[in-house]
């Protein structure tokens, strides 16, 4: 039975040209995390494999950085980066857990969000 839950940064906003950290956390399960995939609308951004480490999609390698932890840092944001992001935790023996984050990239300094997950 899948008992775990995913906590995410939820709905977040950031300024165009800036950076943002996407974070998910899996709790309430003793399942082993074998891999975490980060996707944006069915496009694979990055993989963190427990055995082989981080792999960043060649399409995003200039704007995506691994971490911190199992999170993902998006850099040089554009308005086209607005949308849904998913952290997909592949675990054993539970199976797959998915978290959702909605990112809105704003044109000006009207982006407001707690500094905990934002890089100045």
């Amino acid at each position: 039975m899948m008992t775990g839950t995913i906590e995410t940064t939820g709905n977040i906003s950031a300024e165009k040209g800036g950076s943002i950290i996407l974070q998910c956390h899996l709790s309430s399960t003793t399942a082993q995390v074998t891999q975490v995939n980060w996707e944006q609308q069915d496009q694979l951004l990055a993989i963190c494999n427990a055995d082989l480490g981080w792999h960043i999609s060649p399409s995003f390698k200039d704007r995506v950085a691994p971490g911190p932890g199992l999170g993902l840092t998006l850099q040089s944001l554009t308005v086209n980066d607005t949308g849904e992001y998913f952290c997909i935790y592949h675990t054993y023996p539970d199976g797959t857990y998915t978290g959702r984050i909605f990112l809105e990239v704003l044109e000006s300094s009207v982006a407001e969000h707690g500094a905990r997950f934002q890089i100045p």
């Epitope: 694979l44 494999n49 055995d51 390698k61």
Partner: antibody
Amino acid sequence: QVQLVQSGAEVKKPGASVKVSCKASGYTFPAYYMHWVRQAPGQGLEWMGIINPSLGLTSYARKFQGRVTMTRDTSTSTVYMELSSLRSEDTAVYYCARGGRTTWIGAFDIWGQGTMVTVSS
Amino acid sequence: EIVMTQSPATLSVSPGERATLSCRASQSVSSNLAWYQQKPGQAPRLLIYGASTRATGIPARFSGSGSGTEFTLTISSLQSEDFAVYYCQQYVVWPPLTFGGGTKVEIK
């Protein structure tokens, strides 16, 4: 040209170990993942594991964990797959296959010719 | 693990006809799917990667489509050398990377 050449057929007794080699040529050996896949007679393809030839990092299918060891020798561009505690169900053709670059993921574009391992008492 | 299911298990087709092979993933693999061809006594050969990109040297009669969980390999006009077993494979989540059970394309 790019190719993978595997060692010859083996006949082993139950409980023994086998070590199959796969020598790569024609490309930058450390830059691409190497996988091992096996195929029992008349059956489909079964992934066993992967090795990063540059760092030596490995990831094994849970089914084989504790029984399989994948290593590499960068000086000879060779990867090895050792399977221990052999049983009759391990009778199969074992293939090495080149995967994607170690910076990303990819399909298996180059395959070895296969090594037949027969386990019989 | 991601389970790959191929259908049909066997496909009987006449030379010159079109063959359509299906592959379904138990969860999304985006476009990280490959198709391989295997003839008796030979190692598999990569046909398609990225769900729809032909590998080097693969004839244009082979085409792949789909994304997410549903994928198709189409052979537009079967040649005698195309009768073989075809496998799909996801290569985005490991361990383990997983193959479908295969579709045997035989002469009708």
